[in-house]
């Protein structure tokens, strides 16, 4: 699951969100990691066009940093997940109304593909910035 390599982000969708020259984790479980991850972001990004101005920038940051995780280079390149705190804040503060709608649609099977689910992290499974500040990315 966590097999991949570090590379500079060269896509377009997350250009404004990710730090310039950021090293991101590209997952080799995809045949073409760059293209596959960019497509994931692009698909989810289009859905964000209709969300509130409070939600949108927070959701974009969450999305980009979840799909293109910060990469810690080394003998074994490691993705650094988003901190649970930021994920929760996006889900239940910045985007509370939108998140409810999305969960409702998911339960009712209104999404045509499961792609959007891959782009939404499960907050409870993410590390906390209070337990080990180096284990996750603070946005």
């Amino acid at each position: 699951d966590n097999k991949g390599y570090c590379a500079q982000y060269r896509g377009e969708v997350c250009n404004a969100v990710l730090a310039k020259d950021a090293l991101v984790f590209l997952n080799t479980s995809y045949a073409d990691p760059e293209e596959a991850q960019e497509l994931l972001v692009h698909t989810a990004w289009n859905e964000l066009k209709v969300v509130s101005p409070v939600c949108r920038p927070a959701a974009e940051a969450l999305l980009c940093n979840h799909i293109f995780q910060e990469c810690s280079p080394g003998v074994v390149p490691t993705p650094i997940p988003i901190c649970r705190e930021y994920c929760l804040a996006v889900k239940e503060l910045f985007c509370a109304k939108e998140w409810l709608v999305m969960e409702e649609k998911t339960h009712r099977g209104l999404y045509r593909s499961e792609m959007h689910l891959l782009s939404v992290p499960e907050c409870s499974k993410l590390p906390s910035m209070h337990w080990d500040p180096t284990a996750c990315a603070r946005l």
Epitope: A58, R84, E85, Y86, C87, L88, A89, E92, L93, F94, C123, S124, K125, L126, H130, W131, R138
Partner: antibody, heavy 118, light 107 residues
Amino acid sequence: QVQLQESGPGLVKPSQTLSLTCTVSGGSISSGGHYWNWIRQHPGKGLEWIGYIYYSGTTYYNPSLKSRVTISVDTSKNQFSLKLSSVTAADTAVYYCAREVGIAFDYWGQGTLVTVSS
Amino acid sequence: DIQLTQSPSFLSASVGDRVTITCRASQGVSSYLAWYQQKPGKAPKLLIFAASALQSGVPSRFSGSGSGTEFTLTISSLQPEDFATYHCQQLNSYPPTFGQGTKVEIK
């Protein structure tokens, strides 16, 4: 809508242990990755964070109270509890339970006044 | 621990006034700062999170700004129901800490 409700004795004798329980309704303590907190407010003063518990049992306490505080969780009852030992008059306060949603406390109990007096 | 200092501690104002409360942190807290409103005998209520984001259901006359060590809460036109105590709080690093509170009273 998540609701929190504190319960426990309103009067505790000095040197004894203060025990409070917070019951959560409208949501599960075990889901979502939230921290469940205790906060207190001395009469006419500001707010003081006591500590939190995660559904797994992981705790984090305010260093200033750490030696006297124990927070526990009972997921089957959807409750978490506070025990504060060796209390003095300085522990007289309104005690609140609250849910932390990453970067803020979004849901609070109504608070319960605990008086330490013989 | 990070100390938060609110100013002023007390503020007398009239309905319709523009009110500004400042919160200064002893060290940088990024944008991990929240504001709460508390009425007598009630629990605090979340108004602003992440320094400037308005909590759902909070009137737009409330706004927050700042980052790092200096933050402000502004009420653009004070309403009768806004007379209360306001607290700032940081969650950038543990333990979470609160300001001492600012009581907004009727002039």
